[in-house]
Interface confidence: medium
């Protein structure tokens, strides 16, 4: 038993570069040869276990053979040489590894970075893959000295083990070298204090001002190297709820500070606020953001009225009347505050008025049957809303001029009212609606319109496949004007069931047939026709179509003494509906005929 | 249930001077109206005079016009008539009345929903 190696391969370490060709030699010791009665013919060369095809290898002498590969692309390779000693037992004579990729591309894109209370990070872009143990090797040098080397661990960075030196130039670069070749890049002159990244500002608080409800104060602690550093900020903002960032321009910002009036905000309203900061001129990198901090600017009075209306009860045989005037809580943006209260100030003539405060959005008053001015206004704890009046008529006064040409429609899932003002100037105008209902009263709902508005969707929330009824009316500064109403639906369906037919009157080849409209609440949409479906036990099935106007209709020529079954169906814009069926049996017979 | 007291009635000479007092209780409705009217024996109750409790506007029969003076404390839920230069036709019984109606027609005791007991004044030479 032979305890050295029968023989080797040269190259014992070989690494080649992908796609290129290779040769590999082995070559066996006379010991070897003598022992096993072999020579160069019987060597058997083998890739990952399986044998290599013969006319890849060269027999160069008794004691030498060579194996050539082309176009080598496997990473990885396990390479041997074998023998078949005595001419049939295989046996290893050496194996080696053969490794193939890339040498080192040039790095390039070298950068750096000074991040606050930290050693220098400098990264690049070492290129493609090389598929090899390849070390890069960040180089930096003062003009007269030279800093300890960086051994990246990931070849794609590396922080240096020494503090930086600022106000002073350094030379950096990156060298990449492997078993295929070495490289340098191009390398980067700077002052490291021109690549510093702050930390982030701290301690962010926000305080309003009772002055002005449009600002918000913010103060900060910057720390830019412990005040080695001028730092300029960026400060975003945006309002509680909202996803996207408002950027206060950073002109304004650019000078150092610590603090800072944000201005234009909407009063009582929650804001969020964050901070960064980057050296002064504008050379660096800029801080992460800072922890956010919110504050909510100071209330303001109300920036308008609350929409405003009124319903009389009348009563009869009585002096006065009951009015209920009603009004809409302002959205929080024009409320500007908490409202505490309303104030509303009723006057019947100069001298007569009468103040309350409510805290509710309605008022149910008594009134003679004179005219009335009231008027409305919010309170928050900075003041009172502008007011808003409405002129209650005498209910002796006929109300004069509605709109026109009232229309409604759906579109994008919201229903849509529009109409052409009247020909006298109009204060405002009130849309009511409620759903029809035979189960239930019409609750209504309301909202007001400016006077410019002519075409406006009901902000309800509103449900498919009910009939809505929509009131538009005009107010003058006189009054009201005239009320126009009209129906119609966000989404129709097919009705839920259909008419229920009966006979009115059946003769020997005819039948009056009748049915009753279908409740509103089972129409879910404007009945636009009828079909009505009649056969024989053993006839074809005939249909007529019937304006959806009509309670009745007459089959004329039916057969004398026929079983007739008879069924309807109601037809909206979106699909129709069977009623059930119903029988009849015509007589043999016409009144007054003999057999 | 609403509830009106009148009090500070009484004899007084011709020239002389009395407050009434009326405290309202019980009232779950925004008054609008405070009224005091008068009745004498065999005639209709009319009206004296009377303040929009929000507004604090007034309203007096011309009768009483310069010599009487109607006000109110509403943090006592009370209304006064200040009655100088009685006349011996003042001589009555007076009543505080509470109205919901707001009206310039506030001396109407048709319009007023609640009434007090009454306080006699009686007016002599």
């Known amino acids: 038993q032979l305890l050295e190696p029968c023989g080797y391969i040269y190259p014992e370490f070989p690494v080649v570069q992908r796609g290129s060709n290779f040769t590999a030699i082995c070559v066996l010791k006379e010991a070897c040869l003598q022992h096993y009665y072999v020579n160069a013919s019987y060597i058997v060369w083998k890739t990952n276990h399986a044998a290599v095809p013969r006319e890849q290898v060269t027999v160069i002498n008794r004691t030498t053979s060579s194996v050539t590969f082309t176009d080598v692309v496997l990473p990885s390779v396990q390479l041997t040489c074998n023998i078949l000693s005595f001419g049939q037992i295989e046996q290893n004579v050496y194996g080696v590894t053969m490794l193939s990729g890339f040498p080192p591309d040039k790095p390039t894109n070298l950068t750096c970075i000074v991040n606050e209370g930290k050693n220098m990070l400098c990264q690049w872009d070492p290129g493609r893959e090389t598929y090899l143990e390849t070390n890069y090797t960040l180089k930096s040098e003062w003009a007269t000295e030279k800093f300890p080397d960086c051994q990246s661990k990931h070849g794609t960075s590396c922080m240096v083990s020494y503090m930086p030196t600022y106000y002073v130039n350094i030379e950096v670069w990156v060298e990449a070298e492997n078993a295929l070749g070495k490289v340098s890049s191009e390398s980067i002159n700077f002052d490291p204090v021109d690549k510093v990244k702050p930390t982030p500002p701290y301690n962010l608080s926000v305080t309003n001002s009772e002055e002005l409800s449009s600002i918000l104060k913010l103060s900060w602690v910057s720390s830019g190297l412990g005040g080695l550093l001028d730092l300029k900020s960026d400060i975003q903002y945006r309002t509680k709820d909202a996803s996207t960032w408002i950027q206060v321009p950073l002109e304004d910002t650019m000078s150092p500070r610590t603090s800072f009036t944000v201005q234009d905000l909407k009063p009582f309203t929650e804001y969020v606020f964050r901070i960064r900061s980057i050296k002064d001129s504008g050379k660096g990198y800029w801080s992460d953001w800072s922890e956010e901090a919110s504050g909510t600017t100071y209330e303001d009075r109300p920036s308008r009225p609350p929409s405003f209306w009124y319903k009389t009860n009348p009563s009869h045989g009585q002096e006065y009347r009951s009015v209920r005037l009603i009004w809409k809580a302002l959205p929080l943006s024009e409320a500007n505050g908490k409202i505490l209260d309303y104030e509303v100030i009723l006057t019947q003539s100069k001298s007569v008025s009468q103040t309350y405060t409510v805290t509710g959005t309605e008022l149910t008053v008594n009134l003679t049957n004179d005219r009335y001015v009231a008027s409305l206004a919010a309170r928050n704890k900075v003041g009172k809303s502008a007011a808003a009046v409405l002129t209650i008529p005498s209910p002796h006064v006929t109300a004069a001029y509605s709109v026109v040409n009232l229309k409604a429609f759906p579109k994008d899932n919201l229903l849509w009212v529009e109409w052409t003002p009247p020909p006298k100037p109009v204060s405002k105008y009130i849309l009511e609606w409620c759903v029809l209902s035979e189960n239930a009263p019409c609750v209504e709902d309301w909202q007001q319109e400016d006077a410019t508005v002519n075409r406006t969707h009901l902000r309800g929330r509103l449900l498919e496949s009910k009939c809505y009824q929509i009131t538009v009316t005009p107010v003058f500064a006189t009054g009201p004007g005239g009320s126009e109403s009209l129906k119609a639906y966000l989404k129709q369906a097919a009705p839920a069931r259909g008419p229920t037919v009966r006979t009115k009157k059946v003769g020997k080849n005819e039948a009056v047939l009748a049915w009753d409209q279908i409740p509103v609440d089972d129409q879910n949409g404007f009945i636009r026709n009828y079909s009505i479906s009649y056969r024989t036990s053993v006839g074809k099935e005939m249909v007529v179509h019937v304006d959806s106007s009509h309670t009745e209709y007459t089959l004329s020529s039916l057969s004398s003494d026929t079983l007739y079954m008879v069924r309807m169906a109601a037809y909206t814009d979106e699909g129709g509906k069977d009623g059930p069926e119903f029988t009849f049996t015509t007589p043999k017979f016409a009144q007054g005929e003999i057999e | 249930q609403v509830q009106l007291q009148e009090s500070g009635g009484g004899p007084v000479q011709a020239g002389g001077s009395l407050r009434l007092s009326c405290v309202i209780s019980g009232f779950t409705y925004r008054q609008t109206f405070m009224g005091w009217f008068r009745q004498v024996p065999g005639k209709e109750r009319e009206g004296v005079a009377a303040?929009?409790?929000?507004?604090?506007?007034?309203v007096y029969a011309d009768s009483v016009k310069g010599r009487f003076t109607i006000s109110q404390d509403s943090s006592k839920n009370t209304v006064y008539l200040e009655m100088n230069g009685l006349k011996l036709e003042d001589t009555g019984m007076y009543y505080c009345?509470?109205?919901?109606?707001?009206?310039?027609?506030?001396?109407?005791?048709?319009?007023?929903?609640?009434w007090g007991q009454g306080t006699q004044v009686t007016v002599s030479s």
């Open positions: 009345a509470a109205s919901t109606v707001i009206t310039s027609e506030s001396i109407n005791r048709g319009l007023y929903q609640y």
């Open positions: 303040i929009s409790t929000g507004g604090g506007s007034t």
